[in-house]
């Protein structure tokens, strides 16, 4: 087999709700023909399942083969470098990939103008890959919370707020002129999952009309 290939230095998952991506760092001095083999182990079924024989990218979408993540004990993944007939030792993820590793996001934040106030609606994620019964609110059925950041123009500051426990909120804005921009970061009080700030959604108030911008 000649000289042994070095193993990928690190392998890890980066996941959002039903978007489970395995990443790895390349081996040093890889050639144009170097590719990577990916295998997956489901806890409770103690055998490795080959997922990809030769990926030339440094990530692999494992969502389709980990759809039961939210009802399972989790997964481990491993990756090795392959170059022709040579291959490296496996590098295994350091931690169990479970629901705890999923970064929480919101689908979007909708802002609507009403008589004297802005109504904000937090839309929960609705990934296409998710099975019909596996909604965000069914999996995280209790203790959903949201940190809300509001920025006003004119003005120099962004104001963050204590976590709120509802998906709807109101901003009292009668007579206001300017732009209000909102971001939301979800969490679940009973869990340790990280949350990610949403894209900023803005609404402009004038005396005559309003516009929504991203």
């Amino acid at each position: 087999h000649g000289t042994e290939l070095p193993s990928p230095p690190s392998v890890w998952f980066e996941a959002e709700f039903f978007h489970h991506i395995l990443h790895w760092t390349p081996i040093p001095n890889q050639s144009e023909s170097t590719c990577y083999e990916v295998a997956l182990l489901r806890y409770g079924i103690e055998s490795w399942n080959s997922i990809s024989n030769c990926s030339q990218t440094l990530s692999y979408d494992l969502t389709a083969v980990t759809l039961d993540l939210y009802h399972s004990n989790g997964y481990r993944a491993r990756v090795r470098a392959v170059d022709g007939s040579r291959h490296s030792n496996w590098t295994v993820t350091n931690t169990r990939f479970s629901v705890d590793e999923v970064t929480l996001t919101v689908g979007s934040v909708n802002l609507e103008i009403h008589n004297g106030f802005i109504l904000g609606k937090i839309q929960l994620p609705r990934p296409k890959m998710a099975p019909a019964n596996d909604t965000y609110e069914s999996i995280f059925s209790h203790f959903r919370e949201y940190e809300i950041a509001i920025r006003k123009v004119p003005g120099n500051f962004t104001f963050t707020h204590k976590k709120v426990k509802h998906e709807n909120f109101s901003l009292l804005t009668s007579g206001e002129v300017g732009e209000f921009c909102v971001q939301v970061k979800p969490s679940v009080a009973s869990r340790s999952n990280k949350g990610m700030w949403s894209k900023e959604e803005c609404i402009s108030l004038t005396r005559q009309y309003f516009t929504v911008t991203n």
């Epitope: 509001i150 004119p154 104001f159 009292l172 007579g175």
Partner: nanobody, 126 residues
Framework: DVQLVESGGGLVQPGGSLRLSCAAS????????IGWFRQAPGKEREGVSC????????YYADSVKGRFTISRDNAKNTVSLQMNSLKPEDTAVYYC???????????????????WGQGTQVTVSS
Amino acid sequence: DVQLVESGGGLVQPGGSLRLSCAASDFTLDYYAIGWFRQAPGKEREGVSCISSSGGSTYYADSVKGRFTISRDNAKNTVSLQMNSLKPEDTAVYYCAADAACMVVAGTLILPDDYWGQGTQVTVSS
């Protein structure tokens, strides 16, 4: 840095009145909503009242409606809370806080994380 300073607290008999003021140094209040919050001993901080930067929107907690009035004087860079018909249960430390807008969730005024004053004590007792 934003510095908010409350004043006007004190000891008052039930049924009496107090006027609290919130002033800012090195910070123009007129761009921002100002909320009044209070914290009684052993209780969580709760929203009392809020006024939008334009003064066109106000919020009052059910417990103070008809008794408290919030107003702002942007020329003097102050926001005031006139408190009438005070009750013993109004006893608390009162804080003002700056916000981009008065935010209400399920009928409750939501506390901002930053830009708070140090508080002024209000005691209602005979």
